[in-house]
Interface confidence: medium
């Protein structure tokens, strides 16, 4: 079911491009775009468990809507409140940086970080 | 995903199993055997920076008699490249390690990873 | 012996363009990232820009990006600097240094003159 | 991008001393980091990489120490050819950056 383009990892069906370069949060978002996906949207904590023990943080696509007063993924979709147990201390004016052992935290949108998008193949 | 078992990894027409118990060498050279696949190789040096992004440590296919004698890879060829601390005569089996390939006693336990190539 | 030669400095008005060229011998220039350093006059050092051994990775200093473009002939164990739109501050001693599979900068080049002025 | 500031940005030794140069990273690096000496109109030299691994050829009274962002190089007995410019570099994710050197000079 996968067939991921160059310098994409392929796992359980969905393409991952990690980035070894750091970016704003809305940089990223713009070259995750720009290569038709998004910005990581994590269905649960042991999606990316083939790199549980890097010890880097990368943008996901989250980010605070104050319209919904809700955290939202790219696609709309409201933060499962599972999936971070410490969600209620972001900071709203943040964006969230990701862990693939599971942890998340907030920091500044204009901060750069590493990035991670997903193309889903089904 | 593709032509990989089912909880591999795909990356550049390789499939890599990301392994995350710990074996002596020599065990995880037969581990992979038993999936089919080798322990890792790495083919070039973008290879091993994506390898270091997804694992910081594991175990490679490149391995030396004594300490006099070459590093060589799985299929016997001299492998070319700097692998940190091999004036230690103790340390025989090399690791992946951040961007960097080290020697390390082959009986510790450390991670290793499997690939075979599409 | 590992040797990097520049060549291709010199004058150029505001807004030229120049290529730089690093012709290197001694090893096998094929396995090894890249990357142009520059030194502006009296000042420190600063990266300008990486590729990776096969060209697929390629990062570029905010401050060229858009304006240089970085590239290599592995046939002719070449690596290249285009600089377009080129600006005052641009003046400095390019030099370029090779990466050991991912250690650092581990050789260098002697350095090449580039001066934008009108 | 990733900032690295050095001190002190000059400094006066006298050969047979021991001299203590830092690196403060704005963000952890893990032990990416590496020392490079420069003389005047010559290219730079790797020293240390790995934060305290020695290049192969340095002679042993150059060593590093630090993980994270906090690092150090020290000459343990300076010799008539260690004085020069030092710089720290960065190489734990692009774009790669140096701090603004470190110079060393004869008291």
């Known amino acids: 079911c996968c067939s991921c383009q160059e310098k994409w990892v392929g796992y359980r069906c969905n393409c991952y491009f990690i980035s070894s370069e750091q970016k704003t949060w809305n940089e990223s978002r713009h070259l995750c775009a720009s290569q038709k996906s998004s910005l990581l949207q994590l269905q649960n904590t042991d999606e990316l468990d083939f790199m549980s023990s890097s010890q880097q943080f990368y943008w996901i696509g989250l980010s605070y809507s104050e319209e919904h007063t809700a955290w939202l993924w790219e696609n709309g979709s409201a933060l499962s409140q599972y999936l971070f147990p410490s969600f209620e201390t972001f900071n709203t004016k943040n964006c969230i940086a990701y862990n693939p052992n599971g942890n998340a935290l907030d920091e500044s949108c204009e901060d750069k970080n590493r990035y991670i998008c997903k193309q889903q193949l089904i | 995903c593709g032509h990989c078992p089912e909880e591999w990894i795909t990356y550049s027409n390789s499939c890599y199993y990301i392994g995350k118990e710990r074996r002596t060498w020599e065990e995880s050279l037969l581990a992979c055997t038993s999936k089919n696949s080798s322990l890792l190789s790495i083919d070039n040096e973008e290879e091993m920076k994506f390898l270091s992004i997804i694992s910081p440590s594991s175990w490679i296919g490149v391995f030396r008699n004594s300490s006099h004698h070459p590093w060589v890879t799985m299929n016997g060829l001299a492998f070319k490249h700097e692998i940190k601390d091999s004036d230690n005569a103790e340390l025989n089996c090399a690791v992946l390690q951040v961007n960097r390939l080290k020697s390390a006693q082959c009986g510790s336990s450390i991670i290793y990873h499997c690939k075979h190539k599409l | 012996e590992v040797q990097l030669v520049e060549s291709g400095g010199g004058l150029v008005k505001p807004g030229g363009s120049l290529r730089l060229s690093c012709a290197a011998s001694?090893?096998?220039?094929?396995?090894?990232?890249m990357n142009w350093v520059r030194q502006a006059p009296g000042k420190g050092l600063e990266w300008v820009s990486a590729?990776?051994?096969?060209?697929?990775?390629?990062y570029y200093a905010d401050s060229v990006k858009g304006r240089f473009t970085i590239s290599r002939d592995n046939a002719k164990n070449s690596l290249y600097l285009q600089m377009n739109s080129l600006r005052a501050e641009d003046t400095a001693v390019y030099y370029c240094?090779?990466?050991?599979?991912?250690?650092?900068?581990?050789?260098w080049g002697q350095g090449i003159l580039v001066t934008v002025s009108s | 991008a990733i900032q690295l500031t050095q001190s002190p940005s000059s400094l006066s030794a006298s050969v047979g001393d021991r001299v203590t140069i830092t690196c403060r990273a704005s963000?952890?690096?893990?032990?990416?980091l590496a020392w490079y000496q420069q003389k005047p109109g010559k290219a730079p030299k790797l020293l240390i990489y790995?934060?305290?691994s020695l290049k192969s050829g340095v002679p042993s009274r150059f060593s590093g120490s630090g993980s994270g962002t906090d690092f150090t190089l020290t000459i343990s007995s300076l010799q008539p050819e260690d004085f020069a410019t030092y710089y720290c570099?960065?190489?734990?994710?692009?774009?790669?950056?140096f701090g603004q050197g470190t110079r060393l000079e004869i008291k």
């Open positions: 240094a090779r990466e050991e599979w991912g250690l650092p900068f581990d050789y």
């Open positions: 001694g090893f096998t220039f094929s396995s090894h990232s």
């Open positions: 590729i990776s051994s096969s060209s697929s990775y390629i």
């Open positions: 963000q952890g690096i893990n032990s990416a």
């Open positions: 790995d934060a305290s």
């Open positions: 570099q960065q190489f734990n994710s692009y774009p790669l950056t």
